[in-house]
Interface confidence: low
């Protein structure tokens, strides 16, 4: 740009573009100032006057330099299956993340739209793949010699205890029962737990004034090429 052109609005040289934090206004045919994050264009520029910016109203925001006539609405309050990890400010949207024990069942480019409870494997089935922030638990049948007697999203199949004398043989959903003599080998007391996934993906929640109710998880599993894991339960 020529040295004398310093202030907006100005007509750009043919074939050139406007500078950083400026935009080309088609109506005025001038390079004009953008509004800073937290603001929006209250009055668009003309050939003789620059853009007039104004602060975003409560519950609205702009995250980028912009020339939008209205700020974007912040998403509604986080629903019962989420926690708010970032408040709505003039410069950023509210961010909701799925709470522990839930995962993002329907994602968006900028976060999560729907959280769903992690699948729980019923007795006779254990966790084959733990849930993550964006994927559900995968259950598998307990192999011979192992069992799971819980309904859990974290418990894996555990080996049957080995008895000197077996009173009742174990099966997929029950440990072996020994006679009064102590077993030769057993797992540590209690079930083996996998760590709960920590959700970090943000959610731009539905831009509505009311908090959403947590939808039933049965709605939320994508129809992929393979059927759902056998032995899984909705909740």
């Amino acid at each position: 740009l020529p040295a004398q052109v310093a202030f907006t609005p100005y007509a750009p040289e043919p074939g050139s573009t406007c500078r950083l934090r400026e935009y080309y206004d088609q109506t005025a045919q001038m390079c004009c100032s953008k509004c800073s994050p937290g603001q929006h264009a209250k009055v668009f520029c003309t050939k003789t006057s620059d853009t007039v910016c104004d602060s975003c109203e409560d519950s609205t925001y702009t995250q980028l330099w912009n020339w939008v006539p209205e700020c974007l609405s912040c998403g509604s309050r986080c629903s019962s299956d989420q926690v708010e990890t970032q408040a709505c400010t003039r410069e950023q949207n509210r961010i909701c993340t799925c709470r522990p024990g839930w995962y993002c069942a329907l994602s968006k480019q900028e976060g999560c739209r729907l959280c769903a409870p992690l699948r729980k494997c019923r007795p006779g089935f254990g966790v084959a793949r733990p849930g993550t922030e964006t994927s559900d638990v995968v259950c598998k049948p307990c192999a011979p010699g192992t069992f799971s007697n819980t309904t859990s999203s974290t418990d894996i199949c555990r080996p049957h205890q080995i008895c000197n004398v077996v009173a009742i043989p174990g099966n997929a959903s029950m440990d072996a029962v020994c006679t009064s003599t102590s077993p030769t080998r057993s797992m540590a007391p209690g079930a083996v737990h996998l760590p709960q996934p920590v959700s970090t993906r943000s959610q731009h929640t539905q831009p509505t004034p009311e908090p959403s109710t947590a939808p039933s998880t049965s709605f939320l599993l994508p129809m992929g090429p393979s059927p759902p894991a056998e032995g899984s339960t909705g909740d």
């Epitope: 974007l72 968006k108 539905q206 509505t208 109710t213 709605f219 992929g224």
Partner: antibody, heavy 123, light 110 residues
Framework: EVQLVESGGGLVQPGGSLRLSCAAS????????MTWVRQAPGKGLEWVGI???????YYATWAKGRFTISRDNSKNTLYLQMNSLRAEDTAVYYC?????????????????WGQGTLVTVSS | DIQMTQSPSSVSASVGDRVTITCQAS??????LAWYQQKPGKAPKLLIY???KLASGVPSRFSGSGSGTDFTLTISSLQPEDFATYYC????????????FGGGTKVEIK
């Protein structure tokens, strides 16, 4: 100009298969949720299924197992594969794009729509 | 399975009349509701999205309201070009759903 054009409709016998195409222009198909909707003669709109930006497909309960939605990003084309067709599948099939307003890639409403392609299942 | 119930299924009205169409969701869908207009032989046209927001190029005589489960489309002063069929559509849940559209309301000339 944003435009959707369906093709591939026609007459097919019961039990047969058909693949419909929806050619998109003026935007990148992979950036939007895309849906298929059908309308039997003289009837209302009936949702078939949707594919999201991540490539996951979701189907109406009646369409699961028989209908498959896919897309070819290199051709900017959406597809609907229909198998085991029945007389009651006779309809005009529309593809439509999620509006993706206000910087959201998902809006839950559809615009524009294609002109539709007629599928007739009859022996 | 969220179901969308529209009423009435048809309405007879005259030019200038105020017409109200209701749509009820069987579950809370917040504001994820759209309204469409369809004329014979044509594809549907988006009128309202997110329950109350007017789509681009749609006349201001069309308005939408409601949230949760009960929604309304109002045409404040019916014009000749408004005689058509209107559909509501939920955009909240796509899994285990039979149809995301309501059954439709035909607005006919009285």
């Amino acid at each position: 100009e944003v435009q959707l054009v369906e093709s591939g409709g026609g007459l097919v016998q019961p039990g047969g298969s058909l693949r419909l195409s929806c050619a998109a222009s003026g935007f990148s198909l992979s950036d939007y949720f895309m849906t298929w909707v059908r309308q039997a003669p003289g009837k209302g709109l009936e949702w078939v299924g949707i594919i999201n930006t991540g490539g996951d497909s979701y189907y109406a309960t009646w369409a699961k197992g028989r209908f498959t939605i896919s897309r070819d990003n290199s051709k900017n084309t959406l597809y609907l594969q229909m198998n085991s067709l029945r007389a009651e599948d006779t309809a005009v099939y529309y593809c439509a794009r999620d509006t993706g307003y206000g910087g959201y890639d998902y809006a839950g409403s559809f615009d524009p729509w294609g002109q539709g392609t007629l599928v007739t299942v009859s022996s | 399975d969220i179901q969308m119930t529209q009423s009435p299924s048809s309405v007879s009205a005259s030019v200038g009349d105020r017409v109200t169409i209701t749509c009820q969701a069987s579950e809370n869908i917040n504001s994820w509701l759209a309204w469409y207009q369809q004329k014979p032989g044509k594809a549907p046209k988006l009128l309202i999205y997110e329950a109350s927001k007017l789509a681009s190029g749609v006349p201001s005589r069309f308005s939408g309201s409601g949230s949760g489960t009960d929604f309304t489309l109002t045409i404040s002063s019916l014009q000749p070009e408004d005689f058509a069929t209107y559909y509501c559509q939920q955009g909240y849940i796509y899994i285990d759903v039979g149809n995301i559209f309501g059954g439709g309301t035909k607005v006919e000339i009285k």
